[in-house]
């Protein structure tokens, strides 16, 4: 399963139509198409990875398929519109200041994505305020070729941002992952996603997300009460997406933060987080970028246990093996690392309660003059059962007032000749990221020690 | 608690360098921050010169064109601010400040602890 | 380099009572706006950050608004503490620019 190869499309798929949703028009589907394009899914799910360079495994180290690679096939699928939600945009050197040659995939990338625009293929960009990326010039440019771009006012709405980053292509593939619109995240950073081909059913679903965004980018728009009738989900954990991919029995649904962005029928970002770790019976592995049981980003800082508590509850009451890969950068908080320690400390083996934390620490090497880079981004979680691959990382804010989304898969092993589930290929995904030397535990780690490779 | 402190000569005489020191305790320099350069000038203006950054890097006022430099020592955790060829009109209180925090997907910068100044006189 | 003006420079109010304080930007700064208070011994400190956060420890009485050029600091029950000069400060962009100062008194 390393590297695949999406489809090959037989079928000229039917344009996109403009539809009302309640705020102006929206690059939306009509229902009737909508079922048509269904009756046609043959669903494929890809997972995707960036390993920055320089950033060698061991040899004979499985991996996903280059997030590059991926992304530039879907924009080659694309024949009618591209959507892409994503917290900032930065796909050239000069938008953050460097001059250096693995800003070039980014640059690339963005000159597809004109291209795109010149065949007449629509894009359509939500994007956050507060943005990261403030001086980057991608967004005038391509909305200068006529991409339409609405800046949602995260910061005035919810008082936090638009976090999440995905894709819907045709209204039939997916992208979603850690990975922004970022030059650096194909080259300098860490990344985890998946794609989905052909899944109109799950495409249709995200793009719902897509559309609170849309609506809310609008001048003055306020958060509605009750979301429209059209906004609602009928997939979800209760109601999962049931169907073969690739000839392989799955379930999959796609949540979203914060609540108030989802509408009827949506499960919210970490009720699904936490229905995955509560249906954990054998073991809980999880990659992220921060975890902190607080609040993050507002004051005063408030305790939130909430995920904490769970990891705790399954090591502790079911003997769940808790697994926890926590990233460590230049930029990382080293206020994590108490309730990290808090954490592991939970760990008894004599009494079946197995808690281990690592952080995995990329190597800046010559990579000094790229900003914010050489971190180990991913969002996800896997346990026997289910894959969790998000947008968010774990602390409250990412779930009380930032926009995420979580895809949750699971799929019936045995039932294929070849080929792992994507539970298993998640799993092992993490097992070669925490069993490689990049994975330090924190005893290695002394207390204030800046998150410097030490070879 | 992150305490900052200037100090330096508070008399310079024109066309020499102004030569200042801020002293940083309870915070490394090389970690999470922007540390800054802050000038108010009589009748309270207040000019942005310039930062260090954590990993050594630079950005300077535009204004001050190539009259500023801002180094570092981070084994005695200060920064420096040099400012070349003073006349009279950079007369002021010279502030140095911390921004950030610069964590990773952090929007919202904000100069949170400042030093309380010292002032420079430029007069022959 | 984007301009911040604070148009009145002085203003005072009563003790208990509510003030405005206005700060305007040469161009829209989508709430990438601080304000400071700097007390008469020269002491300067953050007051609000990206136009309405209140930081850690700063009395709720203090509180701001504002959207695309147009923002304001209102300081709601002013104490005797109060008196103070008030900065904006954006930072949508470098340089980092301030505002001329407001300053507060007590009749």
């Known amino acids: 399963w390393q590297v695949r190869r999406p489809p090959t499309w037989g079928q000229v798929q039917p344009k996109d139509v403009p539809r009302s949703w309640g705020h102006g028009s929206s690059p939306a589907l009509e229902p009737l198409e909508a079922e048509v394009r269904k009756q046609r899914d043959s669903c494929q799910l890809v997972l995707v990875e960036s390993i920055p360079q320089d950033l060698p495994f061991a040899a004979g180290s499985l991996s996903a398929q280059p997030l590059g690679q991926a992304w530039l096939q879907l924009l080659d699928t694309a024949q009618e519109s591209v959507h892409v939600a994503s917290y900032y945009w930065s796909l050239t050197g000069p938008d953050i200041g460097v001059n250096d040659s693995s800003s070039q995939l980014g640059e690339a990338l963005l000159q597809k994505l004109q291209q795109l625009l010149g065949r007449n293929i629509s894009l359509a960009v939500a994007t956050s305020s507060p943005t990261l990326a403030r001086k980057s010039t991608d967004l005038q440019v391509l909305a200068a070729r006529g991409a339409q771009v609405r800046r949602v006012p995260m910061g005035r709405l919810t008082r936090g941002v638009l976090h999440s980053k995905f894709w819907v292509v045709d209204g039939r593939h997916i992208y979603m992952g850690s990975a922004n619109m970022d030059w650096r995240s194909l080259t300098q950073v860490k990344e985890l996603g998946a794609v989905i081909y052909n899944c109109s059913h799950l495409a249709q679903d995200l793009e719902k997300t897509f559309q609170t965004y849309w609506v809310l980018g609008v001048p003055k728009a306020v958060l509605p009460k009750t979301w429209p009738q059209n906004f609602s989900s009928h997939i979800n954990r209760f109601q999962p997406f049931q169907g073969l991919f690739d000839g392989v029995p799955t379930t999959a649904y796609f949540s979203a933060s914060p609540p108030a962005l989802c509408p009827q029928g949506r499960t919210p970002d970490l009720e699904a987080l936490l229905a995955v770790m509560g249906s954990a019976q054998e073991f809980i592995y999880a990659s992220v970028m921060e975890y902190f049981p607080t609040t993050r980003f507002s004051h005063p800082r408030r305790y939130w246990p909430v995920l904490d508590n769970a990891l705790r509850a399954a090591a502790f009451s079911k003997g769940v093996r808790v697994r926890l890969l926590v990233s460590c950068g230049l930029n990382t908080d080293p206020t994590m690392f108490p309730y990290l320690r808090s954490l592991q400390a939970l760990s008894n083996p004599a009494a079946n309660v197995s808690v281990d934390v690592k952080v995995f620490i990329v190597p800046v090497g010559n990579h000094s003059n790229i900003p914010f880079s050489r971190v180990n981004h991913s969002k996800f979680m896997v346990t026997e059962k289910a894959a969790y691959i998000g947008t968010s990382n774990w602390s409250e804010d990412y779930f009380s007032s930032t926009t995420g989304v979580g895809l949750v898969v699971t799929q019936s092993p045995g039932a294929q000749p070849a080929g792992a589930t994507v539970q298993e290929q998640l799993r092992q995904l993490f097992e070669r990221d925490w069993s490689s030397r990049y994975a330090v535990g924190l005893d290695g780690q002394a207390p204030g020690q800046d998150c410097v490779w030490q070879g | 608690d992150v305490q900052l402190q200037e100090s330096g000569p508070g008399l310079v005489k024109p066309s020499q360098s102004l030569s200042l020191t801020c002293s940083v305790t309870?915070?490394?320099?090389?970690?999470?921050y922007y540390w800054s350069w802050i000038r108010q000038f009589p009748g309270n203006r207040l000019e942005w010169m310039?930062?260090?950054?954590?990993?050594?890097?630079?950005n300077y006022n535009p204004s001050l064109k190539n009259r500023i430099s801002i180094t570092r020592d981070t084994s005695k955790n200060q920064f420096f601010l040099k400012l070349n060829s003073v006349t009279t009109e950079d007369t002021a209180t010279y502030n140095c400040?911390?921004?950030?925090?610069?964590?990773?997907?952090?929007?919202?910068?904000?100069?949170?602890?400042w030093g309380a100044g010292t002032t420079v006189t430029v007069s022959s | 380099d984007i301009q911040m003006t604070q148009t009145t420079s002085s203003l005072s109010a009563s003790l208990g009572g509510s003030v405005t304080i206005s700060c305007r930007a040469s161009q829209d700064i989508d709430n990438y706006l601080n304000w400071y208070q700097q007390k008469p011994d020269g002491t300067v400190k953050l007051l609000i950050y990206y136009t309405s956060r209140l930081h850690s420890g700063v009395p709720s009485r203090f509180s701001g608004s504002g959207s695309g050029t147009d923002y304001s600091l209102t300081i709601s029950n002013l104490e005797q503490e109060d008196i103070a000069t008030y900065f904006c400060?954006?930072?949508?962009?470098?340089?980092?620019?301030f505002g001329g100062g407001t300053k507060l008194e007590i009749k």
């Open positions: 400060q954006q930072f949508n962009t470098l340089p980092r620019t």
């Open positions: 309870g915070y490394s320099i090389s970690s999470h």
């Open positions: 310039g930062y260090i950054s954590y990993d050594g890097s630079n």
């Open positions: 400040a911390r921004e950030g925090p610069l964590y990773y997907g952090n929007p919202y910068w904000y100069f949170d602890v």
